[in-house]
């Protein structure tokens, strides 16, 4: 029986150009976890395996870091990084517990407000 | 969701082996473990051991260390259970289990029934 539970980061929201930490944590239970893997939507970010490592997907491996801990650092953010975000834990013998995490990229103020500073 | 077809159950004597196979009908990032359970009847479902496919690292009940082993092969999407020095108390169907996507828990296949007569 499936008795864990995951805390993650929610609905966040970051500047574009900056970074943000997606942060997941399975608590109550003892199940033993094998590896966890960050998704967006259909896309693969990364995998930390419990006895190989972090392993980036290459397409990301420019503005992702891991850690801290089994999070997830993003950097470098744009408006198209806006989406849903999930934290899979794969563990034995419960199987999967999923969270997920909601990042909306907004455009920075410099960018909003930059009209204003022009010089005619 | 991941398809799985198990193979290989059958009525063996104590202290015979057995080789249950599990093919998955994907293979995807998201494939991370498959398993083996168990349920004897009148009870519940156990786990009896499971498999990485990245590290190929095994995990195993107590109840059947020494005695089972998982392996995988990862060019035909299927994990094995090889059983040996089987004992009445391993009668069960056994089902193979894939944890295959966002969905919590595990995706099963339909089960296999073992039958270790003594």
């Known amino acids: 029986m499936m008795t864990g539970t995951i805390e993650t980061t929610g609905n966040i929201s970051a500047e574009k150009g900056g970074s943000i930490i997606l942060q997941c944590h399975l608590s109550s239970t003892t199940a033993q976890v094998t590896q966890v893997n960050w998704e967006q939507q259909d896309q693969l970010l990364a995998i930390c395996n419990a006895d190989l490592g972090w392993h980036i997907s290459p397409s990301f491996k420019d503005r992702v870091a891991p850690g801290p801990g089994l999070g997830l650092t993003l950097q470098s953010l744009t408006v198209n990084d806006t989406g849903e975000y999930f934290c899979i834990y794969h563990t034995y013998p419960d199987g999967t517990y999923t969270g997920r995490i909601f990042l909306e990229v907004l455009e920075s103020s410099v960018a909003e407000h930059g009209a204003r500073f022009q010089i005619p | 969701e991941v398809q799985l077809v198990e193979s290989g159950g059958g009525l063996v004597q104590a202290g015979g082996s057995l080789r249950l196979s599990c093919a998955a009908s994907?293979?995807?990032?998201?494939?991370?473990?498959m398993g083996w359970f168990r349920q004897a009847p009148g009870k519940e479902r156990e786990f009896v051991g499971a498999?990485?496919?990245?590290?190929?690292?095994?995990y195993y009940a107590d109840s059947v260390k020494g005695r089972f082993t998982i392996s995988a092969d990862n060019a035909k999407n299927t994990v094995y259970l090889q059983m040996n020095s089987l004992k009445p108390e391993d009668t069960a169907v056994y089902y193979c289990a894939a944890q295959g996507g966002v969905l919590s828990g595990w995706d099963w296949g339909q089960g296999t029934q073992v039958t270790v007569s003594s």
């Open positions: 994907v293979r995807t990032f998201s494939l991370s473990d």
């Open positions: 498999i990485n496919w990245l590290s190929e690292s095994t």
